[in-house]
Each structure stands twice: as C-alpha cells, then as structure tokens.
C-alpha cells in the first residue's frame, strides 16, 4: 500500500482547510522539475528564475552567464539554443502552436563572441524547425516544407529539397499522422554523430483523404482547417528517406536510403532513425499490419556516393500475439563497437526485456529477465548500461533507475534509486551527461517531486537541483486526500488501482465513487506519482471517492495483459472499469446508488461503453472529446490494434465496438457529452455522430461544444470545463453547492 | 500563385557565351528575391545566382564568380543570367526560382537545358 500523507503534521488543526477547485484552476499545487540542458561531460546550461540562461561547470563548482535576460528580452525568446562549437545561440521568439509536437517560430542568432545579433542573411519567418548540427555551428532548418543548409549562421543557405508543398510534400518535418502516432516529434531530420551527413525524411500526402473542419474565429465567415488525416483503412502518407553529405551539398545532392524488400513489397511504415557512427546508420521500418518491423543497418560507400543496406544487416522484430513493441517499437542503442545493440522486445514468457543483439535477433543475449518489464534505456557507456523498469517490490507503477555493469562478467545489477528516499519517490525518470560523467535523477512522487543531481561513477549524490520547498509550505494547511494503490485479482487478471480517499475517510461510511478511466492500450493510469488535480479537489473538498484502474490492454505488466485487446478495442478494457467497480463495491464503503465514470479521449470511448453496458452501475457520466467509432480515428494508432475495416479483415468489430451502437442503452444514465469543435486529433464528428445516434433513439442526454478548442481544451475552456463537469457531478451525487 | 518560364537555353561551345532569360507572371513578383539553380545528371540542385527583391545585393558561388552575372528588371518581370566563359562542367537544366525572403525559394520554372560542348 503506498499512503500519501494527508498532512504535513500540524497541531493547529483547525487551520487546515480542504483544497477548492480555484486552486486546481490557478495552478497553486503544481510542482517543478529540473532537467539540466547538458553541453558536455561536466556542464550544463539552464535558465534561471530571472530568465538568463546560466552555464554551471559540476567539477569547478562555478557559474556564470551566458545570456543575459536583458537579450533574451530584446527579441522576446522563449527558448534558445546553444551551438556546439559555443560560439552562437539562437534565439525563438513568436511560438505558434500547430499540433501535439509542431510549432513554428521566429529565429534569432546571437554572436556570443561579439556579444551581438547576426546580420545580414537572417532566417525567414516563420521557421518550421531548425536545429544546430552535434558539432561546430552548422544549421539545419525547415522552411515552407522545405530543408535549408547554413555552414554558419551568417552564410547564404543551401536550399535541399525543393518539392515542400502545404498539405502534400513534408521535407524534414513530419505530416500529421507521422506526428501524432509515429514520431512523436516535431522534427524528421537528424544530423550524424559529427555532422557530416543530414538525414531527412520526405513524406508525401497527395493522395490522403482530408479532414475538414470549420474555425470560427471573429470573422464574418469561419475558416476551414484541411488536414491530410489518414483514417483507418484510408491512403497513407508514402515515406522516403534521403541522406545528404553537408559539407558539399551539392555534389551529388540527397541520396535516397533503400526499403527493405520485405518491407517495401506492401504498405509500409518508416518508424525512426538513428545514426551509429557519421558513415552507419540506422533505420526502423514497420508493415502498415503492425506485426512485423525490420532494423536495417546501413552503410555509406564511398566509390559511389550511396547508402547500402545489405541483407545480413536486417535485423525482423514480429509479433504472434499483437503488434510489434508496445506503444512504439523500441529504437536500438548501438554500443562501442557501433555494430551490437542493446533493444526492448518481449522475451518468450512475454515480458518486455533488454535484449543484446550482436549478429541475429535469434541469437540476441537476455540481458534483464523476470515478470515485470524494463521500459528504458537511457545510456551506454564502455562498462556501464543505465535502464529503468518498474521490478522493484512489484510495483507495476513505480520506475526505479538501474545500472548493469556490462564491463565485468558477470554483469552485476544495482537499483540506484531503490532506497534513496524510498516513501518519497518511487517513480523516476534521468538526464545522463556526456559519457554518463553526472546525471540528474527527476522524482515524480508519490511524494513531493524532487530533481538531484549524481556522480555517473559513484552514484553519490552531488546537490538538490530542486525539492520544491515553496510547495511544501503551501501544502502544510492543505487537507490532502489519502491515496492508495492495490491489486484486485480476478480470473487470472490482476486489476492494479488507484483509489483516493477523502481526508477523513471513514470505512464505515458510504462514499460516492467516480471512476476515472483512460483505458488505452500500453497506456498506464494507476503510476505511483504526485498530483494535485481536479480529482484530488474532489475527494478533498467534495468527499469522493475516486479510483483509476488498469484493465486489459495496458502497459508494463507482460503481453498477456497488452495484447488481450488485440483487434477487440472496446471489450475488455469496459469489462474490467465494471469488474473493479464491483469488487469497490463489496469493500462495503461505497455508496451503490451514485456511482459515476469519466474519461477523456480514448477514456472518453471508454466511459461511454461502460455507461451503455447495461448493467445498471452507473447512475452517470462523463465523456470529452471521445473516439465513437474506430473509423473515425488514424490509421496508424487504429490498425495497430484493430487491423483494418475491410471484410476480409476486422470490418465487423469495427462496427460493434462503436457509441452509437449502443444508443438505446444510454436511456437510464445521465450523460454528459463534451468535445471541442476544432479536434485536429479525435475530430468532432466522433461526437457528432454519438449525439445523432442518441437523438435518433430520443435518449435524453447533455452535451458541451468548445468552439475553436483542440483535444487539450486549455486555456479559458479548462476552468469552464471542470467547473461545468463538477456541477455535473455533484448534481449527480446529490451533493449541495 | 507565381509562374515562371525560362529561355535562352540550347548549346554553345566552351569558353562562349549565353543569356538566360525568365519571365515571371502573378501578382507578388516584385516582392520576390530570385535566382537561378542549375542540376547537372546525378548531382544535388546548386544555387548558381541570386539577387535581392531591390537588385541591391547579388550572391555568386565560387565556381561561377566573376563569370556570371545576375540582373532583373522589375517593370518587365524579368530575370536574366549572363553566362561568359562557359566550361564543360556548366553543362546543366538551369532553372528560374523566385522566394519570399533572400535566397529561400518556393517557386520553380520548368528549366532550359544549357549544354557547353566543342
């Protein structure tokens, strides 16, 4: 059981007062982390309070600064970036948010040497992208979907692909569903070890469908936002990869890297990239059935100017039961001999594990076993192989740090993070310097976050980089709810949750109950890590009893649990939120007649399912901005887990697994309907459709729009949001204003 | 939308010359900077000449410096490329490109092929 302390102990005990929904609004409980931007083994920058950016050397115990915030001022900058070679940083200003990842920017460089602004042969604006090469200060950047070369910032560019186009040709940049459900960048391009070669990806969308939707704004007549958006089954993006020598761009100009033919013989995914030294690479390639990925390693020969992928340098990855890796399919870390790799893939008891490739995926070493999973690898070095995974006390949300030494033989394995401050934190993530001389530790809880900062060689702890003190105090008159986090074992399934307790919890009483659900696969809820949020207010100050519970088809506990709702999304995720509630509702502390559900996204999908399962739990619920139909959503998230919407593959569950099916069922709960009306992600029209469906039925059901809002619905629509849906609930629940 | 077509290209013997000629028709021509690329069979696409939305500022790479010369005349909608002294290895499609800002193109003519044999 892990038991978040309900106070800092505190005699005046009517000082403490419970937390409000102002508070989680305005952000008051929120914590900081600090994440060194490292430039060497023993340096690293980060930007002060006073927003100048500070370099501080571990080993000399100094600082000074590089930027003033007086500079940072003048061109208005958000972020920066310093070259390498620390001669120049550049400076972004004007951030405007596109999607999860993409923004664009306007871009700065400032001569550190001369302590002036770079003139002449300035950026264009806005910049896509742009990022300095590992070495010297060479630039790279997309402009108007097109790739640009600076050998240094005051040169001339070189332009490298010409074929950019909005909404067609994406050079160096990633198109939406790449983005979304690929990627997971902002970028698609990647400078080699030392800068000699540019790899970059060219995705072209001619012929994807395009999602429409119309942007309000303040105009006479809205916009329309067009969106190449590939939906389940629809024409997907074609992907080329190009590698082009920096240093004399135009001699043979970008050289294409070949598909596998296994690969290349039907749809096909390209899936990342990563360099091994500046004349190997590395590129993972995926069949648009998720099943099967191939690691291809590439060579440049010299003679005649190409990449060469042989063969023997193909390295298949398949799954039997589900798809390839988890959410992604992990990347490789190359070790010194820049052959051999370390990977995660399932082991054959169906575990994600370290495995050491040197010649053959079959002949891979094991490097770490056991029923739990390793989930990353953060760092190799000559001796030492630094991972995290959830093994520790069996916790399958906690993550603990780890060092195998791969130097000696036998490899010995140590927690670096098991017993640091063991009640405090137990979920950890790490920022290794160059050649893992220091690293910081980030502890996200269940305690008070705290970031520290380590000897790579001893372990030993250097300093607080940053314990949130400020937050402490603030906590010290709060009433905090209590938090658990337990195991219900049913028909061979073991349900981990979360269940947070009012202040004075009382077993003897009866409690309302909300579920909060995200459900998705290789997702994870019940994570032993701190908030203060929307459902702590509600069992604080409301008297609620909130539980998060992890069903089939999520992550880190094994395949059997993750690949269970291959190709049946909407099944077993539902069965398992209505199996919890049931086993809650025999602890005897839970009042049965105001039970409800919620959800967000695919969360949203869920809670919809389980509010028209019929069975009579819930009296309601809520779902925002929910997925309704799997057709509706991209193709490469969709036919991962549900192969595609023909006949002869899973047509037929993709039209059972839909909200609207079940419409009739929604008569006897009360329903809260929520979606913001410019959803590039989960778009509109999947609630569009729910609402149509239930109106058809002449089920009763309430429903809020957020006009112009995307799947985050931040900004004034968050406060209106939570406000709208606490209402909602203590209605339900009958509670007083 | 802009469109450009180039002309002036064809064969010419080595150490002769040529002038390259483009026209450019749409509306936001003159805000333009413009230049001339040239690709040769099996090489990367290299920026040959540049000029500036005024004429007040040129760009030339090494390898054509002093031999080639870049002009536009804004009233007309032209650009030309003045090419002396040519070399087998000038032996290239030439094409028209006009940007939005200094040396960043985002529009392309079709290309003149110029050929320097004896």
């Known amino acids: 059981i892990v038991l978040r302390p309900s106070r800092v102990h505190n005699s005046e005990e009517n000082t403490m007062r419970a937390l409000t929904l102002k508070d989680i609004l305005n952000g008051t409980f929120s914590y900081k982390t600090f994440f060194p931007n490292w430039i060497s083994g023993q340096e690293y920058l980060h930007q002060s309070a006073d927003n100048n950016i500070v370099l501080y050397n571990i080993e000399t115990g100094q600082s000074y600064t590089i930027l003033s915030n007086r500079t940072m001022k003048s061109v208005n900058a958000s972020n920066y970036g310093l070259s390498p070679d620390r001669q120049f940083v550049y400076l972004e200003s004007d951030y405007s948010k596109l999607w999860r990842y993409s923004y664009t920017a306007t871009y700065y460089i400032y001569d550190l040497s001369n302590g002036e602004f770079v003139r002449g042969n300035e950026l264009p604006r806005p910049i896509q992208y742009l990022c300095w090469s590992p070495v010297g200060s060479k630039l790279a950047y997309v402009y108007q979907n097109n790739i640009y070369l600076k050998q240094r910032p005051g040169d001339p560019p070189f332009q490298i692909t010409f074929n950019g186009r909005e909404n067609k040709i994406f050079n160096g940049i990633p198109d939406w569903v790449y983005e979304e459900e690929m990627l997971a960048t902002k970028y698609a391009l990647w400078w080699s070890p030392n800068g000699k070669f540019l790899a970059y990806a060219e995705f072209n969308d001619t012929d994807i469908p395009v999602i429409a939707y119309s942007y309000y704004g303040d105009e006479q007549y809205p916009r329309t936002i067009n969106i190449p958006y590939p939906k389940a089954g629809a024409k997907n993006p074609v992907v080329r990869i190009f590698i082009i020598d920096t240093t004399y761009p135009a001699y043979v100009g970008p050289q294409e890297v070949p598909v596998p033919a296994m690969i290349a013989s039907s749809d096909y995914y390209f899936s990342w990239l990563t360099w091994v030294t500046d004349e190997r690479v590395c590129l993972q390639w995926l069949k648009r059935v998720q099943n099967v990925s191939v690691l291809s390693i590439c060579d440049f020969r010299e003679d005649w100017q190409t990449w060469d992928c042989p063969k023997t340098q193909e390295h298949i990855e398949e799954s039997r039961t589900g798809w390839a890796g988890g959410f992604f399919v992990s990347t490789p870390v190359f070790s010194y001999d820049a052959i051999s790799y370390y990977k995660i893939f399932s082991d054959k008891d169906g575990y994600k594990h370290i495995h050491y490739i040197k010649d053959t995926v079959e002949n891979a070493i094991q490097i770490t076993s056991g029923k739990w999973e390793a989930i990353n690898i953060f760092r190799v070095t000559q001796d030492s192989l630094f991972y995290s995974s959830n093994e520790f006390e069996e916790y399958p949300g906690r993550r603990n740090i780890y060092r195998i030494s791969i130097g000696s033989y036998p490899p010995s394995k140590k927690c670096v993070t098991c017993h640091l401050r063991k009640e405090r934190c137990q979920y950890y993530t790490a920022s290794f310097s160059d050649y893992a001389k220091y690293y910081a530790l980030v502890c996200y809880g269940p305690g008070i976050p705290i970031s520290t900062l380590h000897d790579g060689r001893t372990d030993q702890e250097i300093k607080i980089l940053e314990e949130n003190k400020e937050l402490e105090n603030a906590l010290k008159n709060i009433q905090l709810p209590k938090e658990e986090i337990k195991k219900l074992e049913v028909d061979e399934i073991t349900l981990w949750y979360k269940m947070i307790l009012p202040p004075q919890f009382d077993r003897s009483k009866k409690y309302p109950l909300l579920i909060q659900v995200y459900g998705g696969p290789c997702s994870q809820s019940v994570r032993s890590v701190f908030a203060v949020n929307w459902i702590s207010y509600l069992a604080s100050k409301e008297g609620m009893v909130i539980a998060l519970v992890d069903g089939r088809g999520t992550a880190f506990q094994g395949d059997k649990l993750l690949y269970a709702v291959y190709r049946k999304l909407g099944v077993y995720e539902v069965e398992d939120q209505i199996t919890a509630v049931r086993k809650f509702i025999e602890m005897g502390f839970i009042d049965e007649k105001r039970i409800a559900i919620w959800g967000w996204s695919y969360g949203g999908y869920v809670s919809s399912l389980a509010l028209a399962s019929g069975t009579g739990l819930f009296k309601c619920g809520i779902a925002v901005a929910p997925v309704s139909s799997w057709e509706y959503y991209a193709s490469v998230y969709t036919e991962r887990f549900m192969g595609l919407p023909t006949k002869d593959d899973n047509l037929e569950h993709y039209k059972n697994s839909t909200v609207m099916a079940r419409a009739e069922y929604f008569r006897n709960v009360d329903y809260l309907l929520i979606h913001g009306t410019a959803d590039d992600n989960v778009h509109f029209q999947n609630s569009a459709q729910i609402a149509k469906a239930l109106v058809n039925a002449q089920v009763d059901f309430q429903a809020m729009w957020y006009s112009d809002q995307n799947h985050g619905l931040s900004g004034l629509s968050t406060n209106h949001l939570y406000t709208h849906m606490t209402h909602f609930l203590k209605q339900c629940f009958s509670l007083s204003d | 939308e802009v469109q450009l077509v180039e002309s002036g290209g064809g064969l010419v013997q080595p150490g002769g010359s040529l002038r390259l000629s483009c026209a450019a028709s749409?509306?936001?021509?003159?805000?333009?900077?413009m230049g001339w690329f040239r690709q040769a069979p099996g090489k990367g696409r290299e920026l040959v000449a540049a000029?500036?939305?005024?004429?007040?500022?040129?760009y030339y790479p090494d390898s054509v410096e002093g031999r080639f010369t870049i002009s536009r005349d804004n009233a007309k909608r032209m650009v030309y490329l003045q090419m002396n002294s040519l070399r087998a290895e000038d032996t290239a499609v030439y094409y028209c490109a006009v940007g939005q800002y200094d040396w960043h193109f985002d529009y392309w003519g079709q290309g003149t092929q110029v050929t320097v044999s004896s």
């Open positions: 000029i500036s939305r005024t004429g007040g500022s040129t």
């Open positions: 749409g509306s936001i021509y003159d805000l333009y900077t």
